[in-house]
């Protein structure tokens, strides 16, 4: 079945009067960018920049677009078929066990360790023991133990954004 392009799929400046276009479901499902009507007879388009759906679905409502927190940058905006993509600002990263916030990367490794990996939006700097080459996954070292890899004081272990 051919993809249905509705007014809601267009950028806001391209849209005419606000009006949710409808089409018919295919085997009880509506295409990405739409949700199903209460009676199951229509597919109603999501609202551009407000909500979305990514798959063929029988959802009564489209999903709300994510809004990037302060401390995050928007890599790509929300469309009717794709959620917003947010990324931690430079110098911060998001851990798997605390995905709700970006934490500041450490500025250096503890004494006796060398940096083998840079700060990325997904990971802190990576440190290994000079001799053994084993990774260090401990807490941020005390100031006097830190060997900074750049000027300035070590970062605090946690930075709450938003």
């Amino acid at each position: 079945e051919s993809a249905l392009i509705t007014q809601q799929d267009l950028a806001p400046q391209q849209r005419a009067a606000p009006q949710q276009k409808r089409s018919s479901p295919s085997e009880g499902l509506c295409p990405p960018g739409h949700h199903i009507s209460e009676d199951g007879r229509d597919c109603i388009s999501c609202k551009y920049g407000q909500d979305y759906s990514t798959h063929w679905n029988d959802l009564l409502f489209c999903l709300r677009c994510t809004r990037c927190d302060s401390g995050e940058v928007e890599l790509s905006p929300c469309t009717t078929t794709r959620n917003t993509v947010c990324q931690c600002e430079e110098g911060t990263f998001r851990e798997e066990d605390s995905p709700e916030m970006c934490r500041k990367c450490r500025t250096g490794c503890p004494r006796g360790m060398v940096k083998v990996g840079d700060c990325t939006p997904w990971s802190d700097i990576e440190c290994v023991h000079k001799e053994s080459g084993t990774k260090h996954s401990g807490e941020v070292p005390a100031v006097e133990e830190t060997v900074t890899s750049s000027p300035g004081t070590p970062a605090s272990p946690c930075s709450l954004s938003g």
Epitope: G28, D58, L60, F61, L63
Partner: nanobody, 127 residues
Framework: QVQLQESGGGSVQAGGSLTLSCAAS????????VGWFRQAPGKEREFVAA????????VYAYIVKGRFTISRDNAGNTVSLRMSSLEPEDTAVYYC????????????????????WGQGTQVTVSS
């Protein structure tokens, strides 16, 4: 985690009105669709009404359409269910529930998709 707390239940005469409230708290609570469900003694829990994250889109069970109205405050953290022309058959424990959205199968009693439930509030309608 999203926490849901219902209030406003009570006893009322047939033909009367009652307004239930559901207070949603927790990270991104206002991003969720919220629905009201009810369970009468000896019966399955059933869908009553739901609204999307903004409160702009609403859906009702056929049996309550025209009598019940679901609404959401601007902050998105309180969802109300205004019930009028109440009948003894409306007697049940009313539950608030939240999910990113609800599948249409929820209208037929498929509740597996729901992420969060409140504790419920009792509504009794006497004739």
């Amino acid at each position: 985690q999203v926490q849901l707390q219902e209030s406003g239940g009570g006893s009322v005469q047939a033909g009367g009105s009652l307004t239930l409230s559901c207070a949603a708290s927790g990270r991104a609570a206002s991003d969720y669709a919220v629905g009201w469900f009810r369970q009468a003694p000896g019966k399955e829990r059933e869908f009553v009404a739901a609204c999307n994250w903004s409160g702009e889109d609403t859906v009702y069970a056929y049996i309550v359409k025209g009598r019940f109205t679901i609404s959401r405050d601007n902050a998105g953290n309180t969802v109300s269910l205004r019930m009028s022309s109440l009948e003894p058959e409306d007697t049940a424990v009313y539950y608030c529930a939240a999910a990113p959205s609800f599948s249409r199968s929820v209208l037929d009693g498929n509740l597996s998709q729901i992420d969060y439930w409140g504790q419920g509030t009792q509504v009794t309608v006497s004739s």
